[in-house]
Each structure stands twice: as C-alpha cells, then as structure tokens.
Interface confidence: low
C-alpha cells in the first residue's frame, strides 16, 4: 500500500523539514525560518512557537520539531505543553482567588506550588507525634510506647496528599 | 502531540443508553481534571460533567444528574461518560476537554481560572424515534 | 437561555478592531476570572483568553480580554478573515456551583 501511494502522491517522499510546495511542480521545499514539519508527506510547514512574555525557550524551534517553553522565574508550567504558566507561591502558602495565602493551622506545604495538605494525624497508625508539624512541614511519627522495642522503625511516611477542589455532590 | 479523542456516539431512541469515550495521549492524563461540555445542533456551548484526577470529585449539570455518570481510568489515559434514560434535548456533539489539576483549596475551583485548554474533535449524539 | 450574555453577532472589514462583550452577575464574571474561547466552523472549542486577559502561549497578540465589574470584553484587532469563527465566553458561577459560558458571538468579516 505504502508503495502504491508513493507512486501515486509524489509528496509521500517529503521528509521531515520540509513540504510539499505545489506552486513548485509538488517538489520537496525546506521549511522556511521560523516554521517546522514533524512528519513526511507535509503539505505546509507549522509555525514555530514563540516563548514570550513570562514564557521562556526551553527548546528553539528546529526545522523539524516545534519550539518547547517554560515559566520564568516565580512561575510553573500548567496547561497540556506548558500552555500557561502560574505564579509560585512560598512553601507554607497556597494559590487560592485572592493570590498566595498562609497555609491554615494544622496544614502544610512544602513546594511553591501545589495546596495545603493536612498533618498526617499519627494516631490513626497508633503512633505519636515526635516533631510538631508547622505550615511548610508535616508532622513526624513517632513510635507509640508498645513500639519501643529494639529494632522499631521510628519514622512513618506522611499520609498521602488530599486533592484539591471542593467537596463531592 | 496533546490529544483528545471522543468516541461511541450515534443514534439511540429515548430512553436509550450509550457510553463515550475519550482517549488522552500526548500528556500526563492523570494529572488533569476533565470535563464533559455538549453543543445541541446550532447552539452554544452547556457544561455537562467534571472530574478530578483521582475521582475524588465529580460534579454534574442538574439536566443530567441521576442520568449520566462520569468516570476516568488513569491506567488506560480514559475518560467515560455513561449516558442512560437519554431524552431528545441531550442531543448535541460532546467535547471531552481538559484543564489541570487545581491548585488551591476551599469552596472556590481555582482550576477554571485557566479554562479548559485541550479540547476533542467531539462526537455527536442523536436520541431519535 | 444562557447565564452569560453575549451579542448573537458582530462584523468589522479586515484590520479593523472588534469587540465582543459578556455579561453577567456578582456571582460569576465580578467574582470569577472568564475565559473566552473561539470556534472556528466545523471545528471544537480552542481556549483563546484565561484569567480575564491572558493568551495562552500560541495566540495571537491581536487578541485581548478585559473585564469590569460583572462584564468582561474580548478585542480583536487588525482583524482577518481567518478570524471569522463563534466566540463564547466562560467562568465559573458562586451561586449555581458550575462553569456557565455565554449563548455564544458569530464575527463576520465582511
């Protein structure tokens, strides 16, 4: 099939980096600056991505494959190909409406993105606090007194993160 | 390349079920919060249905609640929309798109802030006798 | 009927600048960011403006959103023909906890 077709579509011969320029008797044209084409058989070449603003290149544009952005510093990729960028927040902070906020009491954050996530509460494990938790740290662990024997972990992993959004209807 | 791509749309009577599919490729699917919006035939566009990444929050439009359900399976990048007891008025193309995780907490969805920013072809549902 | 309201149409000739207005409430463009999103014909919706008046990377600088108490506007200048599509806006509504979009705006470039 794939033989076939190239016998009947001169353009399947065009490879990546270029088109197939029908105002040029259907020949293999090099993209143009500022364009790209990923795959054989083109008939136009796609306009580079330009990195602007609080964008910044992270990839330049090749003939044959698009420009990559990322954020600037104080912002984060969000959006399917860094489509966007959000600002940071400090650790012990979330991003809510109204801007970066304090982490409320008995929830941390230790990146400078993401939200606040609870303390992992101890007591459900059987375990007891060891250090207290603050807004950029969770608590950690202890064991409780019947663990106290020679050999016992001392440390638990925090509890898995809460996910953001409100509450289920 | 991001991709959406919706399927197993088609002509059902009243009363009928179907279930659409929406195949994520190109991006951490599990990383996103998605959505189901409809367009009926010459109209706008009407929010349907949304996800959170790990199914911990679901939300419908009242005009489907009880009768459409949404679901997601992370492993196969899948999003579904289980439609039954369909009526004519839930004709329309339906888009599956996707919107990232939110960031921020509390009774406010921050993640609409940045929209819905990859979006399927859409695939059209008749309910006809 | 739709939560947002917007003009069913709007035309302008190649270079000029239109806009295209939404209209809502206290529950939802004064207290929540719009989004506006352009439809090309026999086409899906592709995310034009978030957070009021931010381009995702890949739009064109011709396009611009605002807003202003419970309206917000999407601007576009040195218009094209390529720009002839339905542009819809979006946010999200306090009141009935869900997105809501406007009846959608047809631009003809004449």
């Known amino acids: 099939f794939e033989r076939t077709r190239s016998l009947q579509d001169p353009c399947s011969n065009c490879p990546a980096g270029t088109f197939c320029d029908n105002n040029r008797n259907q020949i293999c044209s090099p993209c143009p600056p500022n364009s790209f084409s990923s795959a054989g058989g083109q008939r136009t070449c796609d306009i580079c991505r330009q990195c602007k603003g609080v964008f910044r290149t992270r990839k330049e544009c090749s003939s044959t494959s698009n420009a990559e952005c990322d954020c600037t510093p104080g912002f984060h990729c969000l959006g399917a190909g860094c489509s966007m960028c959000e600002q940071d927040c400090k650790q012990g902070q979330e991003l809510t409406k109204k801007g970066c906020k304090d982490c409320c009491f008995g929830t941390f954050n230790d990146q400078k993105r993401g939200i606040c996530r609870p303390w992992t509460n101890c007591s459900l494990d059987g375990k007891s606090v060891l250090v207290n938790g603050t807004k950029e740290r969770d608590v950690v662990c202890g064991p409780s007194p019947a663990d106290l024997s020679p050999g016992a972990s001392s440390v638990t992993p925090p509890a898995p993160a809460r996910e953001p959004g409100h509450s289920p209807q | 390349e991001v991709q959406l791509l919706e399927s197993g749309g088609g002509l059902v009577q009243p009363g009928g079920s179907l279930r659409l599919s929406c195949a994520a490729s190109?991006?951490?699917?599990?990383?996103?919060?998605m959505t189901w919006i409809r367009q009926a035939p010459g109209k706008g566009l009407e929010w349907v249905s949304s996800i959170s990444s790990s199914s911990s929050y679901i939300y419908y439009a009242d005009s489907v609640k009880g009768r459409f359900t949404i679901s997601r399976d992370n492993s196969k990048n899948t999003l579904y929309l289980q439609m039954n007891s369909l009526r004519a008025e839930d004709t329309a193309v339906y888009y599956c798109a996707s919107t990232q995780t939110p960031y921020g907490s509390g009774n406010y969805p921050i993640y609409y802030y940045y929209g819905m920013d990859v979006w399927g072809q859409g695939t059209l549902v008749t309910v006809s006798s | 009927q739709s939560v947002l309201t917007q003009p069913p149409s709007a035309s302008g000739t190649p270079g000029q600048r239109v806009t295209i207005s939404c209209s809502g409430s206290r529950s939802n463009i004064r207290s929540n960011s719009v989004s506006w999103y352009q439809q090309l014909p026999g086409t899906a919706p592709k995310l034009l403006i978030y957070g009021n008046s931010n381009r995702p990377s890949g739009v064109p600088d011709r396009f611009s959103g605002s807003k202003s108490g419970t309206s917000a506007s999407l601007a576009i200048s040195g218009l094209r023909s390529e720009d002839e599509a339905d542009y819809y806006c979006?946010?999200?509504?306090?009141?009935?906890?869900?997105?809501?979009f406007g009846g959608g705006t047809k631009l003809t470039v004449l």
């Open positions: 190109g991006f951490t699917f599990s990383d996103y919060y």
């Open positions: 979006g946010t999200w509504d306090d009141r009935l906890n869900r997105p809501v």
